[in-house]
């Protein structure tokens, strides 16, 4: 017998869709091969109309797609738009059509409900509005209207014109008569809930006289939309629950067991500490709609969520919903890096940022996560040389080692540089990633002086000591600017006498600038490296002053300036926030706004990551 | 307080008929899957029928071993579950439960894809 299991029988409606599950040992082979989907012939033979390889047959053109999900071990067929020339025998199945291992699947597409014996069908989803229309004659104009609900053999009277609402409707019914040119008069239901369905009449007038009229109310459940991520990348939630809830409570819920559903995020300020720092709720728009990303997805965030709409901010018997069924793929794309680093008080981290490496020439930017209200990522830093003002000197992000991962170092390092920050691009929005730096005690490997002065036409010499630890790395002098740090000559002066208990591969390497002028004032790093990738890093800033004694300058530890906690602030920024996430490359919107420089600051938080793979900030 | 109550077991002979219906109380909302399976004595309690309902579509699944014999059927917004068995056979004597869950997801031949059980019922085939 076939290994393949699924639905024996599949019953719908014209018009509706279905969602096909097959289920499939989950061995490496079957995970891989070929799924598809196809009609049995009179004559026997299985026509395909859709497989994992990409063949759609023009018959499911526009409404039809197959999903795989290799960890699960199952594939779904959905299929939209169904007519009643849909029914028939299909096999869902795995490798080669005539190969057996598949299983059968009758499909059977019925009419769909229309105006059976004067009968109005009215199809809502839950959460949502109706209105029952009830015409009525003249005769009837001034009597009372009512509408009722079939209870059993009883119709429960639900609304009327004299002002009654039945208690299951309190606060989420009216009645409205038209004007006296219309011989209608309509119910309104809001808030539908699962157990408003059913059986209605409406009446105008009580006696043997009164018009009445039947309707069907079906509220359905939403159908989740079936959603397939990798591990460790990201996802957009987009929640579009109509204008009519637009100043209403949003919120974001997973369902943890049967009807429970757990907020993950919501407007009123709640978050899942799971989520913290590596979500973000986007701002409503006019229409009410609003999204949520969730990045450094874990395989625990799988399972299904809800989107809605209520007073409380958390799912409540009514609340409209939208409904996603989240699974994440283990054999991921992105590649594992760092979700913590740590570094030292006045230290540095080097922080690998992957990307999709098709996207190369994509721009890479870096955004510390901040916690309050939405959660927002104002950008500090990017590709194209822009750096925020408050971050000058001290942070630059390199295309090294390219290939699939950019680097960010951040030196200078205080207790409030610990938080969350995300590395992202404005190409494949999937390939966000989150990393947690984290300040401990301990102190800097590479030891500069503090702030430096050089003198206009003299030369200045600045030393940096690197512990034997860093004998086999690469050390180098730089110059800070927007665009990265350009490599500058130095000098291998012999071993440091700066450590205690270093031997002989310690070393000093200084920098020698020669007849310093105006444009040799700035930001100096020195740091490691092995190959391209990057290590610990210490600043120097560099003033320069008119001359006033002549000689040169050869600056050691002892003289050094104490070096700031941390330069002014700047109000220059640029972010991605509850209200400006504009850039839809970034953030999956499709609005646009390239460039977003606003005149804004924001605070600081931390949160949670992904795993607990760590990277110390001065090594690899 | 959630219940499910199975009715219609009983003693038949082999080649015989039975129905066997499943009354859900209390659940909050309609389920959305609901199915029976079978524990025979000393066995393991194995997958016997499913049915989903997902918006306005109904999907049935069946274990091999009772295909073309057992029908099964529901009506998601009453929350019943029925089970039309065929062509009684001796191996199929067991205590048959019936499942629900709100949810829709998870293999329906599994356990663990539903979370309310009820107390099940005895039915007994005779050569």
């Known amino acids: 017998k076939s290994p393949i299991f699924g639905p024996e029988e599949v019953n719908s409606v014209e018009g509706n869709s279905v969602s096909i599950t097959c289920y499939y040992p989950p061995t490496s082979v079957n995970r891989h091969t070929r799924k598809y989907w196809c009609r049995q012939g009179a004559r026997g033979g299985c026509i395909t109309l859709i497989s994992s390889e990409g063949y759609v047959s023009s018959k499911y053109a526009g409404r039809a797609n197959l999903t795989n999900f290799p960890e699960n071990g199952t594939f779904v067929v959905n299929i939209a738009q169904l007519s009643q020339d849909d029914s028939g025998r299909y096999k869902c199945g795995l490798g080669i059509n005539s190969r057996g291992l598949s299983f059968d699947v009758s499909l059977e597409v019925s009419q769909g409900p229309g105006l059976l014996n004067d009968t109005k069908v009215y199809t809502v989803d839950l959460g949502r509005t109706v209105t029952i229309n009830c015409p009525f004659k003249t005769e009837n104009a001034q009597k009372r209207k009512s509408l009722y609900k079939q209870i059993g053999l009883y119709p429960v009277l639900v609304i009327d014109s004299s002002g009654y609402v039945n208690p299951n409707y309190t606060g989420r019914i009216r009645l409205d008569i038209q004007g006296t040119g219309q011989l209608l008069f309509s119910v309104v239901i809001n808030q539908l809930r699962l157990s408003d369905a059913g059986q209605y009449l409406c009446q105008a007038g009580d006696d043997s006289n009164s018009n009445k009229k039947n309707a069907d109310l079906q509220v359905l459940k939403p159908e989740p939309e079936l959603v397939y991520e990798d591990l460790r990348g990201s996802v957009t939630f987009h929640c579009a629950l109509g204008p009519e809830v637009a100043n209403v409570a949003k919120f974001l819920c997973r369902q943890s067991s049967g009807e429970n559903c757990d907020v993950v995020v919501n407007t009123l300020g709640k978050r899942a500490p799971a989520f913290e720092g590596r979500i973000l709720l986007n701002p409503q728009d006019k229409d009410g709609s609003f999204s949520v990303v969730i990045t450094g997805l874990r395989k625990e965030d799988a399972g299904r969520y809800l989107c809605g709409a209520h007073s409380d901010g958390q799912l409540q018997e009514g609340s409209p919903i939208q409904a996603w069924q989240l699974f994440v793929n283990e054999e991921s794309t992105i590649p594992r890096s760092p979700t913590v680093v740590k570094g030292v008080a006045g230290g540095s981290v080097a922080v690998l940022c992957p990307y999709n490496r098709k996207e190369s020439k994509s721009i890479k930017y870096w955004c510390l996560w901040e916690g309050a209200q939405n959660g927002r990522c104002p950008l500090l830093v990017d590709s194209e040389g822009w750096v925020k003002a408050q971050y000058e000197g001290r942070l630059s992000l390199l295309e090294e080692p390219g290939n699939g991962t950019f680097t960010v170092i951040l030196n200078q390092l205080t207790s409030r540089d610990a938080g969350f920050y995300w590395c992202l691009t404005n190409g494949d929005t999937l390939w966000r990633t989150t990393v947690e730096i984290k300040i401990i005690e301990g102190e800097p490997n590479l030891k500069v002086p503090g702030n430096v002065t050089a003198v206009l036409g003299e030369t200045l010499k600045v030393p940096c000591h690197f512990p034997c630890k860093f004998s086999s790395y690469e050390k180098y002098w730089c110059k800070w600017n927007n665009t990265g740090c350009q490599a500058l000559p130095s000098q291998d002066e012999g071993p440091s006498k700066a450590f205690v208990n270093c031997d002989e591969n310690s070393r000093l390497v200084s920098l020698t600038l020669n007849l310093v002028t105006r444009a040799d004032e700035g930001w100096y790093w020195c740091g490691v490296k092995q190959g391209h990738f990057y290590g610990e890093t210490a600043a120097v800033y560099v003033a320069v002053e008119e001359r006033k004694a002549a000689g040169s300058r050869d600056v050691s530890l002892a003289k050094a300036d104490a070096a700031p906690d941390e330069k002014v602030l700047d109000s220059g920024f640029r972010e991605i926030e509850n209200k400006a996430i504009q850039d839809p490359r970034l953030f999956a919107e499709e609005k646009a706004v390239a460039d977003t420089r606003d005149q804004a600051d924001g605070s600081r938080a931390s949160v949670d990551s992904g795993s607990s793979e760590e990277q110390g900030g001065s090594s690899r | 307080e959630v219940q499910l109550v199975e009715s219609g077991g009983g003693v038949v002979q082999a080649e015989d008929s039975l129905r066997l219906s499943c009354a859900a109380s209390?659940?909050?909302?309609?389920?959305?899957?609901m199915g029976w399976f079978r524990q025979a004595p000393g066995k393991e309690r194995e997958f016997v029928a499913a049915?989903?309902?997902?918006?306005?579509?109904?999907?049935?699944y069946y274990a091999d071993s009772v295909k073309g014999r057992f029908t099964v059927s529901g009506d998601n917004a009453k929350k019943t579950l029925d089970l039309q068995m065929k062509d009684l056979k001796p191996e199929d004597t067991a205590v048959y439960y019936c499942?629900?869950?709100?949810?829709?997801?998870?293999?329906?031949?599994?356990?663990?894809?539903?979370?309310?059980w009820g107390q099940g019922t005895q039915v007994t085939v005779s050569s």
């Open positions: 499942a629900a869950h709100p949810d829709y997801y998870g293999d329906p031949r599994t356990s663990g894809a539903y979370r309310y």
């Open positions: 209390g659940l909050p909302f309609s389920s959305s899957r």
């Open positions: 049915i989903g309902w997902s918006g306005r579509s109904t999907y049935k």
